[in-house]
């Protein structure tokens, strides 16, 4: 009877991009008082772990600690809640969470086509490139949960590049990019050096990111 209860949430602390040998904690939680959580990992081996739910302040949760991250533990995870001892009566699955191991290959370069300081409203494009034949590039912005991704294309100078059009500049931020190969989607390169994009100009035209608190001053906003 899958889906008897609404789906739990699945989070990664400190985040879903994990360096080799570092610690990551996967947390299943819900406002339904689940007795158990099932943590399922898709991949070459399909693995399911049964975790005992802890109840505090109207929330049930369970933590799965990976003390040392390896390539073998990367993959797509989902969490299910169970209110009985039967493993067959489980909730709907949580949204999938991709746990990615980073730092495996050489870092790409990240640059802003018009330079790192732009006028408010100006179109911004960030370019990620490398001599490594990456199939895909992933662009992350500090403070945002999800990365943008684009396929890499070969350039005449022997590099593989992707150009990320960010649209009209409204707010600054710190960006990083990663490269990956088609056959190994959960294994990414080292991070590029961070790129701080600054937006200058009339602050009234400057809209904050949904994940960034509004600035109360007229100064340009920078994410460090």
């Amino acid at each position: 009877h899958e889906g008897v209860h609404r789906k739990p949430s699945l989070l990664a602390h400190p985040g879903r991009l994990v360096k080799s040998e570092e610690t990551v904690i996967l947390q299943c939680w819900s406002d339904v008082m689940f007795e158990h959580f099932l943590l399922h990992r898709e991949g070459m081996f399909n693995d399911t772990l049964r975790l005992i739910g802890e109840h505090h302040d109207g929330v049930s949760k369970a933590n799965f600690s990976i003390s040392r991250m390896t390539q073998d533990l990367a993959g797509t995870y989902r969490c299910y809640g169970s209110v009985t001892h039967s493993p067959y009566q489980v909730s709907a699955p949580s949204d999938p969470l991709d746990i990615v191991i980073i730092g495996l290959y050489e870092k790409p370069s990240l640059s802003a086509q018009l330079g790192p300081t732009v006028l408010a409203g100006e179109n911004v494009t960030l370019s990620c490139s490398s001599r490594s034949s990456y199939d895909m590039y992933h662009l992350s912005r500090e403070g945002e949960a999800h990365e943008r991704r684009l396929p890499a294309g070969p350039k005449v100078n022997g590099t593989f590049q992707a150009d990320f059009p960010l649209g009209p500049a409204t707010h600054g931020g710190t960006y990083r990019c990663f490269g990956s190969f088609h056959d190994s989607p959960y294994e990414w390169s080292k991070s590029s050096d961070p790129l701080l994009v600054s937006v200058t100009g009339n602050p009234s035209n400057s809209w904050p990111s949904p994940t960034e608190p509004s600035s109360k001053t007229g100064n340009p906003r920078h994410l460090h």
Epitope: E21, T48, L49, I66, M69, D72, S184, E187
Partner: antibody
């Protein structure tokens, strides 16, 4: 340096079972998959199944489903492979190997001879 | 019979370049990476190439791997007598949910 050390050679009767151990040292045992691969005399390599110790769920090749049991003991960093209902065709060298996407470290191998 | 097909034998003289092919299908090599292992008689296999073209540390750059479509290839340039061994390709098969190995290729270095 990662090392996988396997138990010694075994001679078994047809119909019996064998349990081979693989002790890991020098790495993070729980976070890496351990697979079992066998090689009959003069033949190629054949994957039997594997386990990621931190999860504890074994995955088996269809050919060996129901006849092989793979387990892992995190407290001793040891993986085990038990093969039941042995027949003469199971005579082979059995290897444990570390890794999920590739096998970067291998045990020295355990020769299992099935003979009446 | 292996689902990944390799030539049973290959040979070359010292200094030559030899290639060993590994043919699969869309459910294995077509969607997953190819690994190559080297095995000397009486010893355990050794990882030679992983993720199609990556070399573990300590493996000479004379060894290289590539993949195209549903086939993989191992190239050995500047062949040396110590390269005489058996070579196996391997790929995960999504349909079978298991690892497949090629039948192996015995490489002979001719004097």
């Amino acid at each position: 340096e990662v090392q996988l050390v396997q138990s010694g050679a075994e001679v078994k009767k047809p119909g019996s079972s064998v349990k081979v151990s693989c002790k890991a040292s020098g790495g993070t045992f729980s976070s890496y998959a351990i697979s079992w691969v066998r090689q009959a005399p003069g033949q190629g390599l054949e994957w039997m199944g594997g386990i990621i110790p931190i999860f504890g769920t074994a995955n088996y090749a269809q050919k060996f489903q129901g006849r092989v049991t793979i387990t892992a003991d995190e407290s001793t960093s040891t993986a085990y492979m038990e093969l039941s209902s042995l027949r003469s065709e199971d005579t082979a060298v059995y290897y444990c190997a570390r890794g999920l996407r590739f096998f970067d470290y291998w045990g020295q191998g355990t020769l299992v001879t099935v003979s009446s | 019979q292996s689902v990944l097909t390799q030539p049973p034998s290959a040979s070359g003289t010292p200094g030559q370049r030899v290639t060993i092919s590994c043919s699969g299908s869309s459910s294995n090599i077509g969607t997953n990476t190819v690994n190559w292992y080297q095995q000397f008689p009486g010893t355990a296999p050794k990882l030679l190439i992983y993720s199609n073209n990556q070399r573990p540390s300590g493996v000479p750059d004379r060894f290289s791997g590539s993949k195209s479509g549903t086939s993989g290839s191992l190239a050995i340039s500047g062949l040396q007598s110590e390269d005489e061994a058996d070579y196996y390709c391997a790929a995960w098969d999504d349909s079978l949910q298991g690892w497949l190995f090629g039948g192996g290729t015995k490489l002979t270095v001719l004097a």
